[in-house]
């Protein structure tokens, strides 16, 4: 079986919880901005 990891911890999405622990960053939403030379520019 492929390694299984649940979705990352509690955030509210229209009263829907992200219920399962998983890697940090999953289901966190996109970063707004552009990465240039290691600096995020809005």
């Amino acid at each position: 079986d492929a390694e299984f990891r649940h979705d990352s911890g509690y955030e509210v999405h229209h009263q829907k919880l992200v219920f399962f622990a998983e890697d940090v960053g999953s289901n966190k939403g996109a970063i707004i901005g552009l990465m240039v030379g290691g600096v995020v520019i809005a």
């Epitope: 492929a2 911890g9 229209h14 919880l17 399962f20 622990a21």
Partner: antibody, heavy 112, light 112 residues
């Protein structure tokens, strides 16, 4: 409103197959891991399959491994459970669950 | 797999009186992000499980404040400050820190 609606249960003979479906609505289905949990008559809750948000990773306990297959169609907001080589001990109510929300369940009866 | 052990198995209660259910896990439920994914469900007769408490002590949407959760590491407690007739059913603890998602065996709460 979050809703999970199962279908596809019924009476099947030992060795037979069934495919359960779970129609999800009210949330961004493609962003969440999903599971199937079963409950035999008068018994507790048993996880039978889990799948991550993009369908790339799955988990099965030994009791169903090699017989059951979980899958999802994120375009249709639907979760599936293909059950093959069914046994009498697979008789149970099968719930589609996201952890915080559960469907109403669908009864699978395996009997000759 | 993480084993979840609940006690008592059965709990006769008097309306208006407090009640308490214990849950112990075979390993720590603290995840690497510091959160503890220990939850409590109530399954009323003929219904699917409903989430009461998530992450040890957080009441889910619509859950009355007479329900509270506490604990840490491997030992957890669900308390009902004043039991009402509608609280009867089977209570399950559950963990989703570790794969697979696992459940306690249940505690049946009934009115004396």
């Amino acid at each position: 409103e979050v809703q999970l609606v199962e279908s596809g249960g019924g009476l099947v003979q030992p060795g037979g197959s069934l495919r359960l479906s779970c129609a999800a609505s009210g949330f961004t289905f493609s962003s969440y891991g999903m599971s199937w949990v079963r409950q035999a008559p008068g018994k507790g809750l048993e996880l039978v399959a889990s799948i991550n948000s993009n369908g790339g990773s799955t988990y099965y306990p030994d009791s169903v491994k090699g017989r059951f297959t979980i899958s999802r169609d994120n375009a249709k907001n639907t979760l599936y459970l293909q059950m093959n080589s069914l046994r009498a001990e697979d008789t149970a109510v099968y719930y589609c669950a996201s952890g915080d929300y559960w469907g109403q369940g669908t009864l699978v009866t395996v009997s000759s | 797999d993480i084993v979840m052990t609940q006690s008592p198995l059965s709990l006769p209660v008097t309306p208006g009186e407090p009640a308490s259910i214990s849950c112990r896990s075979s390993q720590s439920l603290v995840y690497s992000n510091g959160d503890t994914y220990l939850h409590w469900y109530l399954q009323k007769p003929g219904q699917s499980p409903k989430l009461l408490i998530y992450k040890v002590s957080n009441r889910f949407s619509g859950v009355p404040d007479r329900f509270s959760g506490s604990g840490s590491g491997t030992d957890f407690t669900l308390k009902i400050s004043r039991v009402e007739a509608e609280d009867v059913g089977v209570y399950y603890c559950s963990q989703s820190t570790h794969v697979p998602w696992t459940f306690g065996g249940g505690t049946k709460v009934e009115i004396k």
